[in-house]
Interface confidence: low
């Protein structure tokens, strides 16, 4: 009995096509773009979501200083190659045979090269820093209330285990959420921090990936938390490899 069964939709991924053609007439949902079957009882991997997005019709002081090795997704959207489990393939190439290596959240971690470029392994992003700026409010949010509400959000909406929310920092108007998840910590069935961060990012932008759900209504003691800017930094278990030219640019 899949989570999609009742009315044959995918609660965790609206970018799917569902039909009762699974075993025993059960509902089965496939991601747009890739056609891969998805598990509707948990978050869909970021790779499949990006692929689906590219296939969809186009519409018009206590704060942490990110490490020198932190990556920001400056390349924007691309149509990724996903492996049979829905993870990003370590090497991504575009239609003009330009290739690059990515981490487990699909962010480029090397200079671009040609088809001879080798990406030996998919390097895991083990630390994600979500940097938010909220709109002005009458006063600062209470830090402990804000902390509890954001932890609750990741725990209840994305079902990310509390151990992976390492910290919530706040210096009005900047909020930072640190997610940490080493390869050794992630057990079977655990939501991946990269997937949770992507769902959160889309929620914050008013582009919820959940089926038929209202947008994210974040409140701290009844006060709306409205985000006006989001920056996400990704730290990999192995530092990225860029040429000096990029680093000094």
């Amino acid at each position: 009995h899949t989570a999609a069964q009742d009315n044959c939709t995918c609660p965790t991924n609206k970018m799917t096509v569902c039909s009762p053609d699974g075993p025993g007439g059960r509902c089965q949902c496939r991601a747009l773009g890739s056609g891969m079957a998805v598990d509707c009882s948990t978050l869909t991997s970021k790779c499949l979501l990006l692929k689906a997005r590219m296939s969809a019709p186009k519409n018009a002081r206590t704060l942490v200083r990110p490490s020198e090795h932190a990556l920001v997704d400056n390349d924007g959207l691309y149509d990724p190659d996903c492996d049979p489990e829905g993870r990003f393939k370590a090497r991504q190439c575009n239609q003009t045979s330009v290739c690059w290596c990515v981490n487990s959240v699909g962010v480029r971690r090397t200079d671009k090269g040609d088809l001879s470029l080798r990406c030996d392994e998919l390097v895991r992003t083990h630390h994600i820093l979500i940097d938010l700026r909220h709109r002005p409010t009458a006063g600062a949010f209470n830090h402990s209330d804000l902390d509890a509400e954001l932890r609750r959000l990741f725990r209840e909406r994305y079902r990310l285990h509390p151990k992976f929310v390492a910290a919530v920092h706040y210096e009005q108007p900047t909020i930072q959420i640190e997610l940490r998840q080493n390869t050794s910590q992630k057990a079977a069935g655990d939501v991946d921090i990269g997937d949770a961060a992507y769902y959160f990012e889309r929620d914050i932008k008013g582009e919820s990936l959940f089926q038929g759900r209202g947008g994210l209504d974040l409140r701290v003691r009844g006060e709306p938390l409205q985000v006006e800017r989001t920056l996400i930094y990704y730290l990999d278990e192995i530092p990225p490899k860029f040429s000096m030219k990029r680093l000094t640019a």
């Epitope: 009742d6 609660p11 965790t12 932890r151 079902r159 285990h161 509390p162 151990k163 069935g189």
Partner: antibody, heavy 120, light 111 residues
Framework: EVQLQQSGPELVKPGTSVKMSCKAS????????MNWVRQSHGNSLEWIGY????????GFNQKFKGKATLTVDKSSSTAYMELHSLTSEDSAVYYC?????????????WGQGTSLTVSS | DVVMTQTPLSLAVRLGDQASISCRSS???????????LHWYLQRPGQSPKLLIY???NRFSGVSDRFSGSGSGTDFTLKISRVEAEDLGVYFC????????FGGGTKLEIK
């Protein structure tokens, strides 16, 4: 074998505070959230809150915010709950219960309970 | 908070017969991730609650296959086939889709 051993019964006066303990054994204490549940004499169960020992993350039933403080001592695999400004309505049995995320955020093992009586 | 209403309040059955307990929630218990976090516990006299069924229909380890859970959305049922003496006690349903809450309990007695 998973076991949760709670501290003994308490008889306290109104307006005071009490701190009860829950010692865990038979599993990796830091890796499972510990929840606290109250059972009043009418038999009903009320969820108080949880604490995740690994990083101290916690969450509360709104009703118990300010009433209960949850802490842990990882070195002794012990969870604590302190209840403040006690009244006769706080008289109940308090359970600690391990939360099993893989089983859908349910409580798979419970302590034997600590009986609290608030009386002048 | 989500209100969980159990019926009946008490139930007397003969050994070997089937017992059925109903649990209704004031809100739909299907989480946005598609799971339904509805669980059943048994509290035997003088003991703490024990987990029987999690996520509607999954038996916890060591629980007899005489216990089965079913339901969806807001309506759920616990069935006990071939009731045994050790089954007596108070049965609670509970949800953790929202802030966790429990039903008021159903007392199972032996006729």
């Amino acid at each position: 074998e998973v076991q949760l051993q709670q501290s003994g019964p308490e008889l306290v006066k109104p307006g005071t505070s009490v701190k009860m303990s829950c010692k865990a054994s038979g599993y990796s204490f830091a890796d499972y959230s510990m929840n606290w549940v109250r059972q009043s004499h009418g038999n009903s169960l009320e969820w108080i809150g949880y604490i995740y020992p690994n990083n101290g993350a916690s969450g509360f039933n709104q009703k118990f915010k300010g009433k209960a403080t949850l802490t842990v001592d990882k070195s002794s695999s012990t969870a604590y709950m302190e209840l403040h400004s006690l009244t006769s309505e706080d008289s109940a049995v308090y359970y600690c219960a391990r939360e099993q995320d893989n089983s859908g955020y349910c409580f798979d093992y419970w302590g034997q309970g600590t009986s609290l009586t608030v009386s002048s | 908070d989500v209100v969980m209403t159990q019926t009946p309040l008490s139930l007397a059955v003969r050994l070997g017969d089937q017992a059925s307990i109903s649990c209704r929630s004031s809100l739909n218990l299907v989480h946005s991730n598609g799971n339904t976090f509805l669980h059943w516990y048994l509290q035997r006299p003088g003991q703490s609650p024990k987990l029987l069924i999690y996520k509607v229909s999954n038996r916890f380890s060591g629980v007899s296959d005489r216990f089965s859970g079913s339901g969806s959305g807001t309506d759920f049922t616990l069935k006990i086939s071939r009731v045994e003496a050790e089954d007596l006690g108070v049965y609670f349903c509970s949800q953790t889709t929202h802030v966790p809450t429990f039903g008021g309990g159903t007392k199972l007695e032996i006729k």
